[in-house]
């Protein structure tokens, strides 16, 4: 079982060899496409392969902002050829992510296919790591192999790579081990209850608030740190402001997501950026502690 997601992929190529990907769609090249063309081939060691975000079967929704559906395959290929002359292309790609059934806590293994020059899409953090503490996955690149498995998420502890324990391994060494892996990488992962935002911890409730700003401010101040796993919380509400008027948001509430983008593993600066680009309707996923200790 899978669900689909979309991501933007930027490739740098050249007029001679292009970007290293082939598309197919429709029945013939001059026919109007009724569904997006598919990536049918990725050339080894090409920009398309090295980016690590494209796979055969992905649907290309747009090329440099121009929708592929309702165009022809010839037009799509021409857009790629033109982009190669400019050395750069921006693709909007739809892909499948596995709906993995995984426990919210515990230790398990994840196997990921790996090519030498291709990143898995995992960022590991050693921020505020004490001796003997595990490395933490701080980010997973959208569209990457790691993302498509559906099993990994920011906050997961990375215990071992290909049976090499990482207990006292410096982050730089772990990154190097990951880079050098080929074919199939086996990651030993630990998920902790406190990493699961979805899991409603004792005395806490999660809910979503939709704010329509109508051109005005949201009326909230948020605080946190640049440490990936420090919580982002509401630190202030403008008196009679939009957020306060809802009656659903209070100082001390934790923000879990902004417009369905999880803040897990994201620093304060990214949360602020997400709010800035959120548009007219802003959806906040809030976690409220009900029985705050005195």
């Amino acid at each position: 079982i899978v669900h689909t997601e979309t991501t933007e992929v930027v490739l740098c190529g050249d007029p001679l060899s292009g970007f290293g990907l082939q598309l197919q769609g429709g029945i013939f090249a001059t026919e109007t496409l009724s569904s997006p063309p598919l990536v049918c081939f990725i050339e080894p060691d090409s920009p398309a392969e090295r980016c690590g975000l494209l796979q055969v079967g992905d649907r290309v929704l747009s090329i440099n902002g121009i929708a592929t559906e309702d165009g022809t395959m010839e037009e799509a290929n021409q857009l790629l050829r033109d982009a190669a002359l400019a050395h750069k292309v921006v693709l909007e790609v739809e892909f499948d992510v596995a709906e993995s059934v995984i426990p919210s806590s515990g230790t398990f293994h994840v196997k990921l296919p790996k090519k030498r020059s291709v990143e898995l899409g995992i960022t590991i953090s050693s921020a505020s790591r004490k001796r003997g503490e595990p490395l933490i996955i701080s980010d997973i690149k959208k569209g990457s192999v790691a993302h498509r498995t559906g099993t990994l998420e920011p906050g997961d502890k990375l215990l071992a790579i290909d049976n090499i324990r990482l207990d006292n391994c410096p982050m730089e060494d772990a990154v190097q081990i990951l880079r050098q892996c080929e074919d199939l990488v086996k990651l030993k992962i630990r998920k902790d209850e406190d990493n699961s935002d979805e899991l409603e911890t004792t005395g806490a409730v999660s809910y979503t608030v939709e704010l329509k700003r109508y051109g005005g401010p949201l009326g909230i101040t948020i605080s946190g740190t640049e440490e990936p796993f420090d919580p982002i919380v509401i630190s202030g509400l403008t008196k009679r402001g939009l957020a306060e008027r809802t009656g659903a948001i209070h100082v001390g509430d934790r923000i879990l997501a902004i417009n369905n983008v999880s803040l897990k593993g994201r620093p304060l600066s990214e949360a602020i950026h997400l709010l800035q680009v959120a548009g007219e309707t802003v959806t906040l996923k809030i976690k409220k502690q009900l029985d705050r200790p005195l």
Partner: antibody, heavy 115, light 106 residues
């Protein structure tokens, strides 16, 4: 593993009808256009008909236009070819093939039109 | 409709030979040309797509070239398993196939 499996062929009299099916597995069926291609005994390949991934667009060779209807059921991962007013010259092995590059083919099903 | 003309219609060659089959379109089809191999009693198999791209799993002795109206399939060193019938097919407009080239053992 991508697999295409045709069925429904057989012996039919001129003027008769037959419905061919092609069961697909191993790929996202709805993302691909599909074609029917036929091959008369001892002859070359002839494209018959094609349908877009959504089923919204259909195309036919002039030789079968008005007599054959292509369709698909994406929920069943199955492609169909309804053949009416069959003629002796429609006798052939019928293959289904995937996509504009026809990168995967079924094993074929024989349709014989004879009295 | 776009007509595809293949030549030769039959060809005798020996193992190890370099073989070239040509295909001509009745109008420009850019690079929308595919090559297939078919053995008796079997379904066709895609060898080359988009004029020069080698299909996954196909030996590198097969290569394709050309654009516009003139295209070539080359087998650099014939192997015993290469004796078969080869078809070109355009996908620029509604698909059409060449009449086929039968490659036989000399």
């Amino acid at each position: 593993e991508v697999q295409l499996l045709e069925s429904g062929g057989g012996l039919v009299q001129p003027g008769g009808s037959l419905r061919l099916s092609c069961a697909a597995s191993g790929f996202t069926f709805s993302s691909y256009a599909m074609s029917w291609v036929r091959q008369a005994p001892g002859k070359g390949l002839e494209w018959v008909s094609a349908i877009s991934g959504s089923g919204g667009s259909t195309y036919y060779a002039d030789s079968v236009k008005g007599r054959f209807t292509i369709s698909r059921d994406n929920s069943k991962n199955t492609l169909y070819l309804q053949m009416n007013s069959l003629r002796a010259e429609d006798t052939a092995v019928y293959y289904c093939a995937r996509g504009s590059y026809m990168d995967y083919w079924g094993q074929g099903t024989l349709v014989t039109v004879s009295s | 409709d776009i007509q595809m003309t293949q030549s030769p219609s039959s060809l005798s060659a020996s193992v190890g030979d370099r073989v070239t089959i040509t295909c001509r379109a009745s109008q420009s089809i850019s690079s929308y040309l595919n090559w297939y191999q078919q053995k008796p009693g079997k379904a066709p198999k895609l060898l080359i797509y988009a004029a020069s791209s080698l299909q996954s799993g196909v030996p590198s002795r097969f290569s394709g070239s050309g654009s516009g109206t003139d295209f070539t399939l080359t087998i650099s060193s014939l192997q015993p398993e290469d004796f078969a019938t080869y078809y070109c097919q355009q996908s620029y407009g509604p698909p059409t196939f060449g009449q086929g080239t039968k490659l036989e053992i000399k």
